[in-house]
């Protein structure tokens, strides 16, 4: 397995799991246990087909940037540690990364580090800070949600307006209606009363189950026309919130589970 004549050194690549928001810099550290006399250090991303795509390299005291200049390698003063950074990370930078060393004279076998996983999440809306800053760009899914909520509100207002107009134009139509059941009786939840809006956010599904209350059954004469106003349902009660176990993916990785330990 080994070529007995060529020196080599174990590599680590840390942290094992790194999460950054899009637009932020993502920095891994590739560490050599020892500095061999001559070596090439490569930074790779693992492709979906498990192939290593070279992002950047360090050779003979100089950095070799890859095609994408966002991928930068910096040698630290101790000579054994290398910062491997993605400048302004994008969502599609999420994936598996590693570093590898080739010892000179050329060796067909690359000495690879453990793998590390990068997760780039969508930028979330932050509360305004004291220093004025341009409003962050709404992500696609968030934008869709805002548009949807706005549309529902506009629809409800139009319905209210229409009902008011109908009541004003046809006052007889509203006279025969009565409501059966007491006010204290809880509203039933029918099978069709729970549309589920799912915002797919990485590995997590945060679900808001909108419980639309059924209107009380009207007891009106057959010939009476009436309008039913359906208000958007309130969010599920605390008892219906996602269980802790369903949100496990949101927990940070254990500090024990990584190829290297971050200094305190």
């Amino acid at each position: 397995l080994d070529s007995p004549d060529r020196p080599w050194s174990p590599l680590t690549f840390s942290p094992a799991q790194l999460t950054v928001q899009e637009g932020e810099n993502a920095t891994f550290t590739c560490s050599l246990a020892d500095i061999p006399d001559s070596f090439v250090l490569n930074w790779y991303r693992l492709s979906p087909r498990n192939q290593t795509d070279k992002l950047a390299a360090f050779q003979e005291d100089r950095i070799e940037p890859g095609r994408d200049r966002r991928f930068r390698v910096t040698r630290l003063p101790n000579g054994r540690d290398f910062h491997m950074s993605i400048v302004a990370a994008r969502l599609n930078d999420s994936g598996i990364y590693l570093c590898g060393a080739i010892y000179l004279p050329p060796n067909t076998q690359i000495n690879e580090s453990p793998r590390a996983e990068l997760s780039v999440t969508e930028r979330t809306l932050e509360p305004p800070t004291q220093s004025p800053s341009p409003p962050p760009r709404l992500s696609g899914q968030l934008q869709g949600l805002v548009i949807g909520v706005t549309s529902v509100l506009v629809g409800v207002l139009l319905l209210l307006l229409l009902t008011w107009v109908l009541a004003a134009v046809f006052p007889r139509a509203t006279r025969g209606a009565c409501v059966c059941g007491s006010e204290d009786e809880p509203l039933k939840e029918g099978p069709d009363a729970a549309p589920v809006f799912t915002l797919d956010y990485g590995e997590l599904d945060f679900q808001w189950r909108e419980k639309t209350p059924e209107p009380p059954a009207p007891c009106a004469p057959e010939q009476t026309e009436y309008a039913t106003i359906v208000f958007p349902g309130r969010p599920a009660s605390p008892g219906r919130r996602a269980s802790a176990s369903s949100l496990q993916g949101a927990q940070p990785p254990s500090p024990e589970d990584g190829p290297g330990l971050w200094p305190l």
Epitope: S9, A16, S31, E112, P114, E256, P259, G260
Partner: antibody
């Protein structure tokens, strides 16, 4: 909780063989380099063997080269040390440990080589 | 083969500073790890990468490495710090992990 549990230690005659196992739990075993380190009674720590992630590269202390073989089975989360042609000076507590950095160690298993 | 030299023993007065050394040829080019071992227990990593502390290790432990000497410093040593201390490096030429002989620290 990270745990490394060694097993397989025993009393064996000189020239005999033993296979030590180290079962890992609480972390992604396949993503770590691993070491076997031993400590003879009343002596210091002595590195024995190393295997990197993927099991592609191995390294051995001079005194055990050709007699000991380190291997790993990532599917079983287990590290192995096959010890052949055992000698009296191989008597020691054998520890398995994560390597670079050596942040977790097992409690050790005692190997006694004696006639 | 690569050799790491540690003094066999060292003594420090309670709450004083102890400096333990580990000598090796161009050790400054290597990543040094320090271990603490108490009787009947496995070693515990206290410094890695020359000067980094794993979580749970008290701040009084610090490390440095340059030239031919690596140093473990215990600032304000406590009775519980009485133990054996080992340094360790990887030597890429011999392709081996190397331990120092260990220093037995006594806290008076």
């Amino acid at each position: 909780e990270v745990q490394l549990v060694e097993s397989g230690g025993d009393l064996v005659k000189p020239g005999g063989s033993l296979r030590l196992s180290c079962l890992a739990s609480g972390f992604t075993f396949s993503n770590f380099h691993m070491n076997w380190v031993r400590q003879a009674p009343g002596k210091g720590l002595q590195w024995v063997a190393f295997v990197n992630v993927g099991g592609i590269r191995t390294a051995y202390a001079d005194g055990v080269k050709g007699r000991f073989t380190i291997s790993r089975d990532d599917a079983k989360n287990t590290l192995y040390l096959q010890m052949d042609s055992l000698r009296a000076d191989d008597t020691a507590v054998y520890y398995c440990a994560r390597a670079f950095p050596g942040d977790y160690w097992g409690q050790g298993t005692l190997v006694t080589v004696s006639s | 083969s690569y050799v790491l030299s540690q003094p066999p023993s060292a003594t420090v007065t309670l709450r004083q500073t102890a400096r333990l050394t580990c000598g090796g040829d161009s050790i400054g080019r290597k990543s040094v790890e320090w271990y603490q071992q108490k009787p009947g227990q496995p070693p515990v990593l206290i410094i890695f990468g020359d000067s980094s502390r794993p979580s749970g290790i008290p701040e009084r432990f610090s490390g440095a490495n340059s030239g031919n000497t690596a140093t473990l410093t215990i600032s304000g040593a406590l009775a519980e710090d009485e133990a054996d201390y080992y340094c360790q490096v990887w030597d890429s030429n011999t392709k081996a992990w190397v331990f120092g002989e260990g220093t037995q620290l006594t806290v008076l």
